[in-house]
């Protein structure tokens, strides 16, 4: 559940993500200054981040749980002299791959028409048991939907 040691992620607000904040119809010059943007704009950005961050956190939680178990096995094989140099790099991405594979398992289409079913399944797997029925709305959020689609359609190696 720690937020630490999360090197898989690169999820900050990129230029493309920030473009809507630069819409001249929504932001006139007096709301900006030469070095950046005001707090009202940061608030808008944070609104868009929440759903994405939550999915990222779920992935990281699963990855950390998997790595704890796998590192135990790694240690035993290391003691036996069968440890190979590429194991670490393999393990780094494995849990995330498994999570994405699990997300799309048994689903032919990638546009997620079964949001509620997915969220219920996520809820059962969530470590701290704090998922509520209100999570059923999260994948209705466009940011979350787009983010998960991106996760599925992008190779892990492309995002590292």
């Amino acid at each position: 559940r720690s937020l630490q040691d999360t090197e898989e992620k690169s999820r900050s607000f990129s230029a493309s993500q920030a473009d809507p904040l630069s819409d001249p119809d929504q932001m006139n010059e007096d709301k900006r200054h030469s070095q950046g943007t005001f707090t009202s704009d940061y608030s808008k950005y944070l609104d868009s981040r929440r759903a994405q961050d939550f999915v990222q956190w779920l992935m990281n939680t699963k990855r950390n749980r998997n790595n704890i178990a796998k590192r135990h096995d790694e240690f035993e094989r290391h003691a036996e002299g069968t440890f190979t140099s590429d194991v670490s790099s393999y393990l780094e991405g494995q849990a995330a791959k498994e999570f994405i594979a699990w997300l799309v398992k048994g689903r032919g289409r990638r546009d997620f028409p079964e949001e509620v079913a997915i969220v219920e399944e996520l809820g059962r797997r969530h470590a701290d048991g704090s998922f509520s029925d209100e999570m059923n709305t999260i994948l209705d959020n466009l940011a979350a939907r787009d983010f998960i689609n991106w996760l599925i359609q992008t190779k892990i190696t492309d995002r590292k």
């Epitope: 090197e7 900050s12 990129s14 070095q35 950046g36 943007t37 929440r50 209100e134 959020n141």
Partner: antibody, heavy 119, light 112 residues
Framework: QVQLVESGGGVVQPGRSLRLSCVAS????????MHWVRQAPGKGLEWVAV????????FYSDSVKGRFTISRDNSKNTLSLQITGLRAEDTAVYYC????????????WGQGTLVTVSS | DIVMTQSPDSLAVSLGERATINCKSS????????????LAWYQQKPGQPPKLLFY???TRESGVPDRFSGSGSGTDFTLTISSLQAEDVAVYYC????????FGQGTKLEIK
């Protein structure tokens, strides 16, 4: 382990400028948004500014708008804060803070660098 | 901006006793889509930077002793130390991470 080391603080006269730096290690700096948070002597914490992981986007608190500029150099794992038009109320310890997975949440902080504005 | 108000400003508790710090936000920090409250707690010991204890109101950060607990929802939150230890003497801050970050004024915890 994660380390954030600030420098550049000192005593400076009102109206002058100062540049603070923060050198990061122990994590992939380029992947994380970075913040400056300040704390006036004996007072509470105040968020100052944030820069995106690529340095292209920056946000500031209203109290420092137009006077502070946040920047980063990912090739040197360095975060900076350029402060101009210093005021007495800018006197504070300035902390460099790493953002966690969750936006606007700070999981690692530097030890801070003290800026004293005095004539 | 959301205003965070902590109470009390200072607190003296005997070793081994329970310490309770409250935090109130001027508006709700509950995100209904995931039912998470975007409220964090930090501990700051003298001469040190703040240390993250909790996020999402009750999710304990790695390495934080389980005598610490966080609770609350919407606008009212509580940090509880079930059995105060000498090393818990510090100033505690709440922070909302729902929107542009703002902190409470801090609560100084001392030993009685």
């Amino acid at each position: 382990q994660v380390q954030l080391v600030e420098s550049g603080g000192g005593v400076v006269q009102p109206g002058r400028s100062l540049r603070l730096s923060c050198v990061a290690s122990g994590f992939t700096f380029r992947n994380y948004d970075m913040h400056w948070v300040r704390q006036a002597p004996g007072k509470g914490l105040e968020w100052v500014a944030v820069t995106s992981s690529d340095g292209l986007n920056k946000f500031y608190s209203d109290s420092v708008k137009g006077r502070f500029t946040i920047s980063r150099d990912n090739s040197k794992n360095t975060l900076s804060l350029q402060i101009t038009g210093l005021r007495a109320e800018d006197t504070a310890v300035y902390y460099c803070a790493k953002e966690s997975i969750l936006a606007a949440l700070f999981d690692y902080w530097g030890q801070g660098t003290l800026v004293t504005v005095s004539s | 901006d959301i205003v965070m108000t902590q109470s009390p400003d200072s607190l003296a508790v005997s070793l081994g006793e329970r310490a309770t710090i409250n935090c109130k936000s001027s508006q709700s920090v509950l995100y209904s889509s995931n039912n998470k409250n975007y409220l964090a707690w930090y501990q700051q010991k003298p001469g040190q930077p703040p240390k993250l204890l909790f996020y999402w109101a009750s999710t304990r950060e790695s390495g934080v002793p389980d005598r610490f607990s966080g609770s609350g929802s919407g606008t009212d939150f509580t940090l509880t130390i079930s059995s105060l230890q000498a090393e818990d003497v510090a100033v505690y801050y709440c922070q909302q991470h729902y929107t542009t970050p703002t902190f409470g004024q801090g609560t100084k915890l001392e030993i009685k």
